[in-house]
Interface confidence: medium
């Protein structure tokens, strides 16, 4: 049930998309069992969720990846939830780290991030990972979303 | 504070229950510090949360398991959050995967799943795992819930 | 948008703080990109989130830690979300466990906990870990929060 025209529900859940881009920013799509409540939240350039209204949002991301200790850098796999607000510096909101598995050819692991943050109108959130080529894109494994309180 | 009779709070949090059943669907109970806000969400057959009202729900599950690489299949431990709606195919909403530990006799790991999804009246959500015998049922380790936005 | 004076938004997100205390209870601070919606939720003694209003809350914590199997006890690293209410028993709401990594000097891992619980006026929630010295306090790695439904 909607909260009313003055205070509509705002929520999104988008699905990971494999990308040939070399950027560390994950790509997302409105596909499968996705959620996009209305135009008060949008997926921009397949990479960031942008909100039109100021307020408190619960923002979350889940990333499943497959890596091997020998084939990867010594640094762990890190997923970061980042914020970009108009006229402000980018900043990290949340991060999670998992050391690479010794399983061969690679070992799967899942990371979940989530927290409550104040967003300004026009603010965008996106997800960065240390190695996008290790991310698993099978059904349900990697997703990203938010909901306005 | 309730939102009013027209728009009551709808939320549930149920606790894992060990089961002798060989099914991959996890069993849950209204025990311990559980939540069941009202009859607009119910736990059916100890295995699925069913909602009476259409709307956006944040649905989550946490599964802790103990496994060993040598004693398990080569495939990772996978937890899946699944949806069954009246007159529709079952579908996977979220999945997480963790490679088995090399620790002996087994190594504990925890998986967390969560996302925002549109549910129809009569829709049910449930949790599947690759090997229910590996799931940890100690206080607080494995739980499942939802809240209506 | 606020829900109105009768039913204001209540939410918090606090950031981990390294502590010289030997207690297993994690310490938190209102620093960085934190959230504290109003005085209906407060951070007390840097260790617990205390609410003034009864109701259903989604409570979450994320803990990133770095440990090594050889240098740690055989028991896994466990993070517990605990509840303390006036005139009631303390109790564990949620727990997650991760076996220590074999990576050297230590392997990073992240744990996420979250669930919906009924809190009484004056109830406090806090996070316990088996070894606070292993917790990672870099930007975004370890945080704790709640939101009232």
């Amino acid at each position: 049930m909607q909260k009313g025209d003055q205070n509509p529900q705002i929520a999104a859940h988008v699905i990971s998309e494999a990308s040939s881009k070399t950027t560390s920013v994950l790509q997302w799509a409105e596909k499968g069992y996705y959620t996009m409540s209305n135009n008060l939240v949008t997926l921009e350039n397949g990479k960031q969720l942008t909100v039109k209204r100021q307020g408190l949002y619960y923002i979350y991301a889940q990333v499943t990846f497959c890596s091997n200790r020998e084939a990867s850098s010594q640094a762990p796999f890190i997923a970061s939830l980042c914020l970009k607000s108009p006229g402000r510096f980018e900043r990290i909101l949340l991060r999670a780290a998992n050391t690479h598995s010794s399983a061969k050819p690679c070992g799967q692991q899942s990371i979940h991030l989530g927290g409550v943050f104040e967003l300004q109108p026009g603010a965008s959130v996106f997800v960065n990972v240390t190695d996008p080529s290790q991310v698993s894109h099978g059904t349900g494994f990697t997703s990203f979303g938010l909901l306005k309180l | 504070m309730q939102k009013g009779d027209q728009n009551p709070q709808i939320a549930a949090h149920v606790i894992s229950e060990a089961s002798s059943k060989t099914t991959s669907v996890l069993q849950w109970a209204e025990k311990g510090y559980y939540t069941m806000s009202n009859n607009l969400v119910t736990l059916e057959n100890g295995k699925q949360l069913t909602v009476k009202r259409q709307g956006l729900y944040y649905i989550y599950a946490q599964v802790t398991f103990c496994s060993n690489r040598e004693a398990s299949s080569q495939a990772p431990f996978i937890a899946s959050l699944c949806l069954k709606s009246p007159g529709r195919f079952e579908r996977i909403l979220l999945r997480a995967a963790n490679t088995h530990s090399s620790a002996k006799p087994c190594g504990q790991q925890s998986i967390h799943l969560g996302g925002v999804f549109e549910l129809q009246p009569g829709a049910s959500v449930f949790v599947n795992v690759t090997d229910p015998s590996q799931v940890s049922h100690g206080t607080g380790f494995t739980s499942f819930g939802l809240l209506k936005l | 948008m606020q829900k109105g004076d009768q039913n204001p938004q209540i939410a918090a997100h606090v950031i981990s703080e390294a502590s010289s205390k030997t207690t297993s209870v994690l310490q938190w601070a209102e620093k960085g990109y934190y959230t504290m919606s109003n005085n209906l939720v407060t951070l007390e003694n840097g260790k617990q989130l205390t609410v003034k209003r009864q109701g259903l809350y989604y409570i979450y914590a994320q803990v990133t830690f770095c440990s090594n199997r050889e240098a740690s006890s055989q028991a896994p690293f466990i993070a517990s979300l605990c509840l303390k209410s006036p005139g009631r028993f303390e109790r564990i709401l949620l727990r997650a466990a991760n076996t220590h990594s074999s990576a050297k000097p230590c392997g990073q891992q992240s744990i996420h906990l979250g669930g919906v619980f009924e809190l009484q006026p004056g109830a406090s929630v806090f996070v316990n870990v088996t070894d606070p010295s292993q917790v990672s306090h870099g930007t975004g790695f370890t945080s704790f929060g709640l939101l009232k439904l």
Epitope: - | T139 | S85, R88, R91, Q120
Partner: nanobody, 117 residues
Framework: EVQLVESGGGLVQPGGSLRLSCAAS????????MGWFRQAPGKEREFVAS???????YYADSVKGRFTISADNSKNTAYLQMNSLKPEDTAVYYC???????????WGQGTLVTVSS
Amino acid sequence: EVQLVESGGGLVQPGGSLRLSCAASGFTLGNYAMGWFRQAPGKEREFVASITSYGDTYYADSVKGRFTISADNSKNTAYLQMNSLKPEDTAVYYCARDGYTYGVDYWGQGTLVTVSS
């Protein structure tokens, strides 16, 4: 009928020890969390320690490392071993059964512990 009967209180010197017992009847101890609260003169009743049916134990910060809670299901009795007692531990100690979501559902009548030289 559910009943909780405490015993073992008394006068003890600082640094001394006492063991409180809580004999339960009318229910099976192993199905419930059990615990101890205390109320000092002029203060609110406060949580001391508890043990769940799973065997998990909890302690107030003020007693950690000094007090130990245990239960003997065969005797349907819960215990509180109190070591290194301090004057500030002086209070009436109450045994309680946990109704879980709804808090304590049964209390004992209390036993007085006085720590004084």
